[in-house]
């Protein structure tokens, strides 16, 4: 006996169309673009029913339901706006992602997504993944004056990339992006196999303040060319945080130097070092301090560290020096790992040019200079670590 004539569901059609359907005949259902086969909540790629000997179809008719891309995923540090209408997530609906202003900027695309027939929110470039809200780097409440004045107390927002590293000796670092800290290898060498021992604090000016943003380390990456207790060449390390930190006026990453950055780091150009290291009084600073210091000619610095007790070749091409010939302005113990920063006058953003590494036993000594890891030499290394992990 023939099976009942199959009535196509709304927004679908039957194929093949026959006058009647008898034993072993079959039909398939095809949905219009933007509609999908559903049996209840379960999606089907295809649907074919077969006429059975009792004159019934072997399965019930599915629905051709409008494709629903579902609520769009939340964008970390951003928001989503429904353009087509409040809560509309069906075929051809449009949404617009945007990032939290001032502190984040959108990467990858313009943030406009359309619900396509395959059921995925898709950007105008064809991407199905979310855009990225990347922290804006190098923002500071401070603008450089270009002249030297040192031993100043930092004010809120002056050095929002400043990180305090505890868990061994007191050291410093600088926030990169929202989940990495750039520091000196010697400052975290002892914790390289016990990253969780590092107590990382940011968003505070006072070293002993109970008010700070706590971060914990997931992994420590020490440059493979660094040899502990054998000089300070390649004195650079990265700490991966186990969570992203929320960026605000008091916690902002430092920029990495652009290729053109060397033009802002010539001899006598002013960099700024900040930290809670030893002050002239010989104690760790309670308040974050900073000093503006000029870059020193590399040959002059090399010569200053050629005589005993320093071994020949102490200053390498991976280092830069900064300070005054007359002394008095320097970074010191406890500042290790912190950033020596420069203002990129073209982008108007601060970038890290150096990492506080080493210097004379007597900080700020005349004729001696602070020695910093030259960050621009390590951009490929930094980028590789960050992209791989």
């Amino acid at each position: 006996q023939p099976c009942p004539y199959p009535m196509a569901p709304p927004n679908g059609h039957v194929s093949p169309v026959q006058a009647k359907y008898i034993l072993k005949d079959s039909f398939s259902i095809f949905c219009e673009t933007g509609y999908e086969l559903l049996q209840g909540h379960l999606p089907l790629k295809s649907f074919t029913a077969v006429c059975q000997k009792d004159g019934s179809w072997d399965r019930p008719m599915p629905a051709c339901s409008i494709v629903d891309c579902g609520p769009p995923d939340d964008l970390p540090s951003g928001r989503v706006e429904y353009i087509t209408g409040p809560g509309v997530t069906t075929y051809k609906a449009v949404i617009q992602y945007s990032c939290e202003e001032t502190f984040y900027t959108m990467k990858v695309n313009d943030g406009k997504y359309v619900c396509e027939a395959d059921g995925f929110w898709t950007s105008s470039k064809g991407e199905k993944s979310l855009p990225v809200c990347e922290p804006v780097c190098g923002l500071s409440a401070r603008t450089t004056g270009g002249r030297i004045y040192g031993g100043q107390k930092a004010k809120p927002g002056d050095f929002p990339w400043q990180v305090l590293i505890l868990g061994g000796t007191t050291a410093a670092g600088a926030l990169l992006y929202d989940n990495w800290v750039l520091t000196a290898a010697h400052a975290v060498y002892e914790q390289k196999h016990d990253a969780s021992a590092l107590d990382i604090r940011m968003g505070t000016l006072k070293r002993l303040s109970p008010h700070y943003t706590q971060a914990w380390s997931e992994a420590v990456f020490i440059h493979e060319g660094y040899t502990h207790d054998a000089g300070f060449d390649n004195d650079i390390a990265l700490i991966k945080l186990n969570n992203k930190v929320v960026i605000n006026s008091n916690i902002t990453p430092i920029c990495l130097p652009r290729k053109e950055a060397e033009s802002f780091m010539r001899t006598d150009d002013i960099g700024t070092a900040s930290g809670w290291g030893l002050t002239q009084r010989g104690f760790l600073a309670r308040n974050l301090m900073y000093v503006d210091i000029p870059i020193v000619d590399h040959q002059k610095c090399t010569a200053a560290y050629e005589k005993p007790p320093y071994p020949r070749g102490s200053v390498t091409a991976n280092m830069l020096c900064a300070g005054l010939e007359s002394g008095g302005k320097d970074s010191c113990r406890g500042d290790s790992g912190g950033a020596l920063v420069f203002l990129d006058s073209e982008t108007e953003r601060w970038f890290v040019g150096g990492i506080v590494s080493w210097g004379s036993m007597n900080c700020g000594e005349a004729g001696q200079y602070g020695v910093y890891t030259k960050v621009i030499n390590y951009i490929p290394w930094i980028e590789n670590i960050i992209s791989d992990f």
Epitope: Q39, G40, H41, L42, P43, L44, K45, P60
Partner: antibody
Framework: EVQLQESGPGLVKPSQTLSLTCTVS?????????WNWIRQPPGKGLEWIGY???????SYNPSLKSRVTISVDTSKNQFSLKLSSVTAADTAVYYC????????WGQGTTVTVSS | DIQMTQSPSSLSASVGDRVTITCKAS??????VAWYQQKPGKVPKALIY???YRYSGVPSRFSGSGSGTDFTLTISSLQPEDVATYYC?????????FGQGTKLEIK
């Protein structure tokens, strides 16, 4: 005939992430259907966790959504479950299955959450 | 979430008896209901889909009926191998939900 086989650690510590994989043989995961994860706590009933469809779209149980990720690796013909921040209440037999017009279930894998 | 309430929660019947298990949905689920049989220590096995369609290989003594909110699984002549827990399930909307189960024993 399609066969499904779950694999993954039988013991997970509280607060950690449970990770299971379902390997599909005898058919392609991208050919059709919704590929589901279902669990059954000891001595209790069945609970649907979620599915990933032939096209890669996911649907999750709202009660677990904040902790669940289901993904697919079509090159290996596998789909996977990740359940984060587990507690003792997540101790169960976990099944992968195809529901509706086909009825294929894995044998189930017991996951115990304990320190 | 749609609640699927099964009754009875357990029952005891004799071989050859006609056994009926009911399932009530808390809201309309059309005919998007399946029935499963689970024997102790075993994987659930589907018997019925779309309320009344029997899976191939399932004995004809198993049948399903209903639509909307009320559904029934009937075993026309109970066999010893039918001892199991039976679950109804709706797949009409997210989340897919199961009944709490009906444990069937032989007298």
């Amino acid at each position: 005939e399609v066969q499904l086989q779950e694999s993954g650690p039988g013991l997970v510590k509280p607060s950690q992430t449970l990770s299971l994989t379902c390997t599909v043989s005898g058919g392609s995961i991208s050919s059709d259907y919704a590929w589901n994860w279902i669990r059954q706590p000891p001595g209790k009933g069945l609970e649907w966790i979620g599915y990933i469809s032939y096209s890669g779209r996911t649907s999750y149980n709202p009660s677990l959504k904040s902790r669940v990720t289901i993904s697919v690796d079509t090159s290996k013909n596998q789909f996977s479950l990740k359940l984060s921040s587990v507690t003792a209440a997540d101790t169960a037999v976990y099944y992968c299955a195809v529901l509706y017009a086909l009825d294929y279930w894995g044998q189930g894998t017991t996951v115990t959450v304990s320190s | 979430d749609i609640q699927m309430t099964q009754s009875p929660s357990s029952l005891s019947a004799s071989v050859g008896d006609r056994v009926t298990i009911t399932c009530k949905a808390s809201q309309n689920v059309d005919t998007n209901v399946a029935w499963y049989q689970q024997k102790p220590g075993k994987v659930p096995k589907a018997l019925i889909y779309s309320a009344s369609y029997r899976y191939s290989g399932v004995p004809s003594r198993f049948s399903g009926s209903g639509s909307g909110t009320d559904f029934t699984l009937t075993i026309s002549s109970l066999q010893p191998e039918d001892v199991a827990t039976y679950y109804c399930q709706q797949y009409n909307s997210n989340p897919l939900t199961f009944g709490q189960g009906t444990k069937l024993e032989i007298k």
